[in-house]
């Protein structure tokens, strides 16, 4: 029995699927994580839902998500980073479902920022640049990036690059003259932690120069 | 069935060096936290040392912080402690344990470490 | 730093219940989970209650666990002695990354 005879909307919500994700962000605000949680099923009823996680915290056993809207969200310093915390979806005391889970293997880092392309007349070739909050953290500092562009008007041909360092040379005859490209890029963790893709960054727009006829090269 | 065996004990001098391993097997190794404890003869148990699952993260007590390294190889599910400038109070049985989802649901047999001139 | 204080030997006869107690130095015994191993004569240790009052797969329920906070203690309670239940417990707990035991208790089961 559930021993929520009484209360209908608990008997319902028992029958319900409460699968969920979760992400942390390291060092995400100063010597702060963050932990954030949703569930997979948007349409899941959450009026009465809370997210408690439990272990491998300092000098607390448990601690109480903030409900943001869909998301469930907690930042704070007291995640030890070793070993395994639970994590429960509940209503009221009762745990509806849980997930042992090591907050160093669901590491989604933060977006790369100041993406930007220059065009080296010289050299016939395009240097990409762009930055990331990691290259001054004390855990998450090593990433795998994910360059990405296309032409403007491939809606779905992307090309993707990945690198290990924020700056990549795009050689100019690989591009097609006087076109408009999209270029974004986004990272993931590389180096004993393990996790998921960031956001990707802005979106960067750079054009091709026209072919020289008589060189048969770019303008 | 889990599995741990720690060996690589023995006696030494003292101010001498000894690796300790401890061989893993019947469960994930590379999602384990895995740690090092000791017992001196006829006393309690003493924390040592711990790993994350990965490596980046160690800690030590403060007796052997300095003299002692753990470390682990997983694609060989091995635990090490690399155990340098030894004393005679390091005499102990050295355990390996496992963290799992709890400290410590699984133990090794253990090691005899002796330091002794 | 904190220590966990526990007594050094208590006794039971066949049948009875006892309880180890283990008590925080400083801070409270509520922050951080307390564990509980067995360590027969001549054996490695092994969990007989983790996370203050779970009990391993394979323990009998004659094991418990709890937490005291106006005590700022831990305590193991066996109830329904039996011989095999004589060996040394500790408790352990944490202390940010590292792990606090207990000095340990032995427990003599009485003929």
């Known amino acids: 029995e559930s021993g929520y005879a009484q209360n209908g909307d608990l008997e319902d919500a028992e029958l319900d699927d409460y699968s969920f994700s979760c992400y942390s962000q390291l060092e995400v605000n100063g010597s702060q994580h963050s932990l954030t949680c949703a569930f997979e099923d948007p349409d899941v009823n959450i009026t009465n839902l809370e997210f408690e996680i439990c272990g491998a915290l300092v000098e607390v056993k448990c601690l109480n998500f903030r409900k943001l809207q869909e998301i469930y969200f907690i930042e704070t310093k007291k995640f030890l980073l070793i070993g395994k915390s639970n994590i429960c979806v509940k209503v009221g005391e009762k745990s509806l479902t849980c997930k042992k889970i090591d907050l160093t293997t669901i590491v989604k880092p933060e977006a790369p920022f100041d993406l930007s392309v220059v065009y080296r007349e010289g050299a016939n070739d395009f240097v990409v640049t762009f930055n990331t909050s990691h290259l001054q953290k004390k855990y998450v500092k090593v990433l795998m990036h994910d360059v990405a562009y296309r032409q403007e008007k491939d809606e779905n041909k992307w090309t993707h690059v990945n690198l290990s360092s924020t700056k990549l040379t795009l050689l100019q005859r690989k591009l097609q003259p006087a076109a408009m490209y999209e270029i974004k890029v986004r990272s993931i963790p590389d180096h004993y932690f393990k996790g998921f893709w960031s956001e990707w960054s802005p979106s960067y727009y750079f054009r091709t120069p026209e072919i020289n006829n008589s060189s048969g090269e770019m303008d | 069935q889990v599995n741990l065996r720690e060996s690589g004990g023995g006696l030494v001098k003292p101010g001498g060096s000894l690796r300790l391993s401890c061989a893993a097997s019947?469960?994930?190794?590379?999602?384990?936290?895995m740690h090092w404890v000791r017992q001196a003869p006829g006393k309690g148990l003493e924390w040592l040392s711990l790993?994350?699952?990965?490596?980046?993260?160690?800690y030590y007590a403060d007796s052997v912080k300095g003299r002692f390294t753990i470390s682990r190889d997983n694609t060989k599910n091995l635990l090490y402690l690399q155990m340098n400038s030894l004393r005679a109070e390091d005499t102990a049985v050295y355990y390996c344990?496992?963290?799992?989802?709890?400290?410590?649901?699984?133990w090794g047999q253990g090691t005899l470490v002796t330091v002794s001139s | 730093n904190f220590m966990l204080t526990q007594p050094h030997s208590v006794s039971g006869s066949p049948g009875k219940t006892v309880t180890i107690s283990c008590t925080r130095s400083s801070g409270s015994i509520d922050s951080s989970y307390v564990q509980w191993y067995q360590q027969r004569p001549g054996n490695s240790p092994t969990t007989v209650i983790y996370?203050?009052?779970?009990?391993p797969s394979g323990v009998p329920d004659r094991f418990s666990g709890s937490i005291d906070s106006s005590s700022n203690s831990a305590s193991l309670t066996i109830s329904g002695l039996v011989t095999e239940d004589e060996a040394d417990y500790y408790c352990?707990?944490?202390?940010?990354?590292?792990?606090?035991f207990g000095g340990g208790t032995k427990l003599t089961v009485l003929c």
């Open positions: 352990q707990s944490y202390d940010f990354h590292h792990l606090v």
């Open positions: 019947g469960f994930t190794f590379d999602d384990s936290v």
């Open positions: 996370e203050d009052d779970q009990r």
């Open positions: 790993v994350g699952w990965d490596g980046f993260f160690t």
């Open positions: 344990a496992r963290q799992g989802d709890y400290m410590g649901n699984n």
